[in-house]
């Protein structure tokens, strides 16, 4: 399990009002265009500057959209999902899954050089102490000769 990436998954209901240029984001995914392996879900690929989604601030690139106005987005072709958004009306309710990447271990102590998750100082301090003791013992031994 070394180097495993964990995700904190949260869901949120986001209500957007269509702006002058629409909802202001792009999507990828669908049964004919898997974006995430073994998942035909619909994901936010781009949030357009100054669009409704950007101004609201809650929807993020990489979010998975689970439903639109209560309609499930499972098992939809990509274009069917696009059309569903375009026909969703003025007030649009999105059920969204956010995935926040979290570190699997003490922050600041985990990395490729330290796969076990043990803080580096806990290794270095005993090693340093042992080295000092060995050096002292060696010097004492030399003096006795």
């Amino acid at each position: 399990m070394n180097g495993r990436v964990d995700y904190l998954v949260t869901e949120e209901e986001i209500n957007l009002t269509r702006g002058p240029s629409g909802l202001g984001f792009n999507i990828v995914g669908g049964t004919d265009q898997q974006y995430v392996s073994n998942d035909s879900g619909i994901y936010v690929s781009r949030i357009k500057e100054n669009g409704a989604a950007a101004l609201d601030g809650r929807l993020q690139e990489g979010d998975k959209i689970l439903s639109v106005n209560g309609q499930d987005l499972k098992n939809l072709l990509h274009q069917d999902a696009v059309d569903l958004f375009r026909n969703a009306g003025y007030a649009v309710s999105l059920r969204v899954q956010h995935r926040l990447q979290v570190q699997n271990g003490p922050i600041g102590h985990r990395g490729e050089g330290d796969p076990s998750g043990i803080p580096i100082f806990m290794v270095l301090v005993p090693v340093f102490a042992l080295t000092m003791v060995a050096a002292w013992a060696f010097m004492r031994y030399r003096q006795q000769l």
Epitope: N26, V28, Q33, R46, L77, R86
Partner: nanobody, 126 residues
């Protein structure tokens, strides 16, 4: 590094044909909508044709029936076949890429903002 490179432009007589190519690199092509735009001297840039990530094609009225857009995901390339060319088709032609599909409008909409742009290729019909 993201790159879009257009080729295939040139000088052609009215009624002639050209095939433009747009080769991309530096991103996962399959998920991108690709558009062809043109800008004639002293005029605004306009969308000509675009193709969604799943292959749905769109055209402006003035080129419908004359231009055909297609994509080859294996070659990271989009083509614009231009037949029955007219003097008014003279312009610099640009391709552009946008990640995913807009939930608001087709890739030809004025509101559509593309992520990446090529340098353009000159088409002259004379």
């Amino acid at each position: 590094q993201v790159q879009l490179v257009e080729s295939g432009g040139g000088l052609v007589q009215p009624g002639g044909s050209l095939r433009l190519s747009c080769v991309s690199s530096g991103f996962i092509f399959d998920y991108y909508a690709i558009g062809w735009f043109r800008q004639a001297p002293g005029k605004e840039r306009e969308g000509v044709s675009c193709i969604s990530s799943v292959g749905r094609a769109y055209y402006i009225d003035s080129v419908k029936g004359r231009f055909t857009i297609s994509r080859d995901n294996a070659k990271n390339t989009v083509y614009l076949q231009m037949n029955s060319l007219k003097p008014e088709d003279t312009a610099v032609y640009y391709c552009a890429a946008d990640f995913g599909s807009s939930v608001d409008s087709t890739c030809l909409s004025k509101e559509q903002r593309f992520d990446y742009w090529g340098q353009g290729t000159q088409v002259t019909v004379s």
